[in-house]
């Protein structure tokens, strides 16, 4: 029998400077592209090697991005979220939610809706 899987959720403000090739990550999610069941939030799906996000080191695949330069990402269409990042300017402030899996008891399995899969 599997033990209970809990998640430690923390928030962090990450300030990135757009590099020569941009911010350097991919996103999934949005009201028209729900990635996690019952959650239309925006998640980081890929950090590009040697990009601004990778060099900074704090943003991780699976992180949920709550806001960009203070603008909430709730209830946005996927393409609108992409456009928001693309038009965010040179200095970009991200409010992100990290979700760290904490194992209690025997080894469990990651849930179907976990964005880090």
């Amino acid at each position: 029998m599997n033990g209970r899987v809990d998640y430690l959720v923390t928030e962090e403000e990450i300030n990135l400077t757009r590099g020569p090739s941009g911010l350097g990550f991919n996103i999934v999610g949005g009201t028209d592209q729900q990635y996690v069941s019952n959650d239309s939030g925006i998640y980081v799906s890929r950090i590009k090697e040697n990009g601004a996000a990778a060099l900074d080191g704090r943003l991780q695949e699976g992180d949920k991005i709550l806001s960009v330069n203070g603008q909430d990402l709730k209830n946005l269409l996927h393409q609108d979220a992409v456009d928001l990042f693309r038009n965010a300017g040179y200095a970009v402030s991200l409010r992100v939610q990290h979700r760290l899996q904490v194992q209690n008891g025997p080894i469990g399995h990651r849930g179907e809706g976990d964005p880090s899969g």
């Epitope: 991919n26 996103i27 592209q33 980081v44 890929r46 393409q79 992409v82 990042f85």
Partner: nanobody, 125 residues
């Protein structure tokens, strides 16, 4: 990981048509950004077509002849190739990136993609 399997290649006469398919594993297919590339003998791998969440794009050499599409319910991407020419002869590869880049997308750059299929041979005589 994502597995990609291409099919539909073959030998066709100039002016003919083929439809390539690329089946991708994974429950989040609809979040994939996808592309077709090709590589002729002795040449570099070159971009053919791309399909994102809300856009498509084509190499100039195939515009008006090739059409890229996807069926999210079947986890499949297609490349309909019409009016084929001998210079279209190559191994055709499908490629996938997870999600949409937040930067201006250089979708013709193979480095933008995370996963690649094994390829399917197209020969136009």
């Amino acid at each position: 990981d994502v597995q990609l399997v291409e099919s539909g290649g073959g030998l066709v006469q100039a002016g003919g048509s083929l439809r390539l398919s690329c089946v991708a594993s994974g429950r989040t297919f609809r979040t994939y950004t996808m592309g077709w590339f090709r590589q002729a003998p002795g040449k570099e791998r070159e971009f053919v077509a791309h399909i994102g969440w809300s856009s498509t794009d084509y190499a100039d050499s195939v515009k008006g002849r090739f059409t890229i599409s996807r069926d999210n319910a079947k986890n499949t991407m297609y490349l309909q190739m019409n009016s084929l020419k001998p210079e279209d002869t190559a191994v055709y590869y499908c490629a996938v990136a997870i999600g949409s880049p937040v930067d201006s997308y250089r979708h013709s750059d193979p480095l933008e993609y995370d996963y690649w299929g094994q390829g399917t041979q197209v020969t136009v005589s």
